[in-house]
């Protein structure tokens, strides 16, 4: 009779195991082991028992005993289990980013790993199990189907392998995958609402909002605003669903024409975008253009108003005749037109808008100088001793310089309050000069003496 | 100076039908002429806008659905599919004018045509 | 665009009261504004424009102020002739997408 001891292991793999083969007969012809496995025979004294050290055990193996004694021969088998944690553990690559609502599936790969009997697979949200199955087939795959909400924002999946061989006297060996971090996010149908300007002018800036409400993690949205090539960069504000991103933009005369503008806002995988047109112009004022800014009394002057090709200008309020960017007036200038303005406004219409520019020039009319009964009368007659003041006013562009001379040498104070006196009395020569010339005027003062009342 | 509106009838939906405008009294190669309409127991709906220089400028809703072109004494209204929801009178208005005080020209429909009916019915 | 809220939507007056309607826009128009008159089976007739001057032939009970982004229809000592619906407009654009009228208001006289 042939016996083995011990009769079941269970042993990590690669490990060793010490096996008796021991036999009931004193003398056996023969006793050994019949095993594919790398063994040493340990000496011991006496015949009816040996001792094996076998080695490197990479599978399960049932290693058997024989003898042959003189009532004939016997065999015993062993049964060796080896036990390993699977190679690999392993949730299937997934978008980071999945969207509220979703189907999301979770795969879970395990390969390796021994005894089968024993392995189980999980799979877990954070400490939460979802799912718990025997771990069949090579390699063994587990799924399971999660709705993604909101709440699940940053949770950390995992798949988790169990060799249980604590019935075997043994320990839970528990093998964990790397965690799969999810991002939930919900992005809106609606496209982000742009309000920007229509239309804006060559060297100014303007001002574009993009905003977007019901997103998740707002945070997280990133913002592209772009018009045309141009790249703004926007200041970003969040509220708890709600983002508003505003930027300056600066256009010059390149980007002259329709330009696209867009708001793109991109979460998760996903992305909305809107479009707007804005159309860039150029329109510099108006010109009024005066033959001459400054001319002499009695001159023909031509006023002109010149502006953008596609504009339609008004000279004065005038209409241009035809209609268009081009308007002007001829006048025969007199002492009345000096100062007078003329204003050019031209409306544009760009993409529909209507814009206004206007520009005015005024009118320099020399002339003069001139001395009338009006301003400076011929005639004085004043009581002795009273109080009066001369006036004698000389009109001109450029104001005249005004002196009155009596006998060429005695002045009449004008605009000066003076007593009069006999002294006063007599025939002046009022003299207005300025570039535009000279003119004279006699100006008589009579003083009346009170023994004449 | 006036405008008047023709060409209005009952169409079965998805029949092309153009509206004309015509304008006496002024030019209209001076003038922005506008389209508006309005349903039955409706508000005022501006429908688009030809230039002086024939840019046209639509509503939103109406893009694709109306075209305005013109000739040198009338402005045309082409409604391209009608549906139902075109039931309406149509109006043409000039829609253009000068303020004396700055010079400025601005849209301001102040000459009104007395409107046509168009029905659209299966 | 230059979105046009025209508040009430409709109103009741006796004869000899007043009537306030406004009008608001979404960006600024200026004084580029206009009030429309319009009764059953007729076009609309212009009342003001420019915000404030009254069209010719129009009585001076209608009055119309406000410039920017606010404006408002004044009428006053109403008369039964002034059952209608009033529109603003706005005179500033035209371009595509835009909306030029406000939505109306009935002004019913008792």
């Known amino acids: 009779q042939t016996s083995v001891s011990p009769s079941k292991v269970i042993l990590p793999r690669g490990g060793s195991v010490l096996v008796t083969c021991s036999t009931s007969c004193d003398q056996p012809k023969l006793l050994g082991i019949e095993t594919p496995l790398p063994k040493k025979e340990l000496l011991l004294p006496g015949n009816n028992r040996k001792v094996y050290e076998l080695s490197n055990v990479q599978e399960d193996s049932q290693p058997m005993c024989y003898s042959n004694c003189p009532d004939g021969q016997s065999t015993a088998k062993t049964f060796l289990t080896v036990y390993w944690t699977p190679e690999r553990v392993e949730l299937a690559p997934l978008p980071s980013w999945q969207p509220v609502g979703k189907n999301l599936t979770l795969r879970c790969q395990v390969e390796g790993g021994a005894p089968r009997a024993n392995l189980t697979v999980v799979l877990l949200r954070g400490e939460k199990e979802l799912k718990r199955e025997p771990a069949v087939g090579e390699p063994a795959e587990v799924t399971t189907t999660v709705l993604v909400r909101r709440d699940h924002h940053g949770a950390n999946f995992s798949c988790r392998t169990e060799l249980d061989l604590r019935p075997q006297g043994l320990e839970l060996f528990e093998n964990t995958s790397a965690p799969y971090q999810l991002q939930t996010f919900v992005l809106p149908a609606t496209p982000p609402q742009l309000v920007s300007p229509r239309v804006l002018e060559v060297d100014t800036q303007g001002t574009v909002v993009c905003s977007l409400d019901g997103l998740f993690p707002v945070s997280e949205a990133q913002v592209h605003l772009a018009l045309g090539d141009q790249r703004l960069n926007p200041t970003v504000t969040y509220g708890n669903d709600s983002f508003s991103a505003k930027a300056s933009v600066s256009v010059t005369a390149e980007d002259e024409g329709t330009q696209r503008l867009t708001c793109a806002v991109i979460l998760g995988n996903q992305s909305q975008e809107t479009l707007q047109t804005v159309t860039i112009y150029s329109f510099p004022a108006p010109n009024v253009i005066l033959t001459k800014p400054e001319v002499s009394e009695g001159t023909e002057v031509t006023v002109k108003c010149e502006a953008h090709p596609r504009a339609k200008v008004t000279l004065n309020g005038v209409p241009a005749q035809p209609l268009g960017p081009r308007a002007q007036l001829l006048l025969k200038a007199t002492p009345e037109d000096n100062g007078r303005s003329f204003s050019c406004s031209a409306t544009l219409e760009v993409a529909g808008q209507l814009i206004h520019k206007n520009q005015t020039r005024e009118l320099r009319v020399l002339y003069g100088p001139r001395l009338d009964e009006r301003d400076c009368p011929g005639n004085w007659t004043w009581p002795e001793n009273s109080q009066q003041t001369p006036m004698c006013q000389a009109w001109g562009n450029p104001l005249p310089e005004l002196k009155c001379l009596k006998d060429g040498t005695f002045p009449l104070p004008i605009g000066e309050s003076v007593t009069v006196t006999r002294d006063l009395e007599g025939t002046y020569l009022c003299r207005a000069r300025s570039t535009q010339g000279e003119v004279t005027r006699k100006v008589t003062v009579n003083v009346l003496s009170p023994r004449y009342e | 100076q006036s405008v008047e509106e023709s060409g209005g009838r009952l169409v079965t939906p998805g029949t092309p039908l153009t509206l004309t405008c015509t304008a006496s009294?002024?030019?209209?190669?001076?003038?922005?002429m506008s389209w508006v309409r309005q349903a039955p127991g409706k508000g005022l709906e501006w429908i688009g806008i030809?230039?002086?220089?024939?840019n046209t400028y639509y509503a939103s809703w109406a893009k694709g659905r109306f075209t305005i072109s013109k000739t040198s004494t009338t402005v045309d209204l082409k409604i391209t599919s009608p549906t139902t929801e075109d039931t309406a009178t149509y109006f043409c208005a000039r829609d253009w004018s000068l303020d004396s005080s700055s010079g400025y020209y601005y849209y301001d429909m102040d000459l009104w045509g007395p409107g046509t009916l168009v029905t659209v019915s299966a | 665009a230059y979105d046009m809220t025209q508040t009430p939507a409709s109103m009741e007056v006796a004869v000899g009261g007043t009537v306030t309607i406004k009008c608001q826009a979404s960006?600024?128009?200026?004084?580029?504004l206009a009030w429309f008159q319009q009764k059953p089976g007729q076009p609309p007739k212009r009342l003001i424009y420019k915000a404030s001057t009254l069209a010719s032939g129009v009585p001076s009970r209608f009055k119309g102020s406000g410039s920017g982004t606010q404006f408002t229809l004044t009428i006053s000592g109403v008369q039964s002739d002034d059952a209608a619906t009033y529109y603003c407009?706005?005179?500033?654009?035209?371009?595509?997408?835009?909306?030029?009228f406000g939505g109306g208001t009935e002004v019913v006289v008792k």
């Open positions: 030809i230039s002086d220089s024939d």
């Open positions: 407009q706005q005179g500033y654009s035209r371009s595509d997408g835009e909306h030029v």
């Open positions: 009294g002024f030019s209209l190669n001076n003038y922005y």
């Open positions: 960006q600024n128009i200026h004084s580029w």
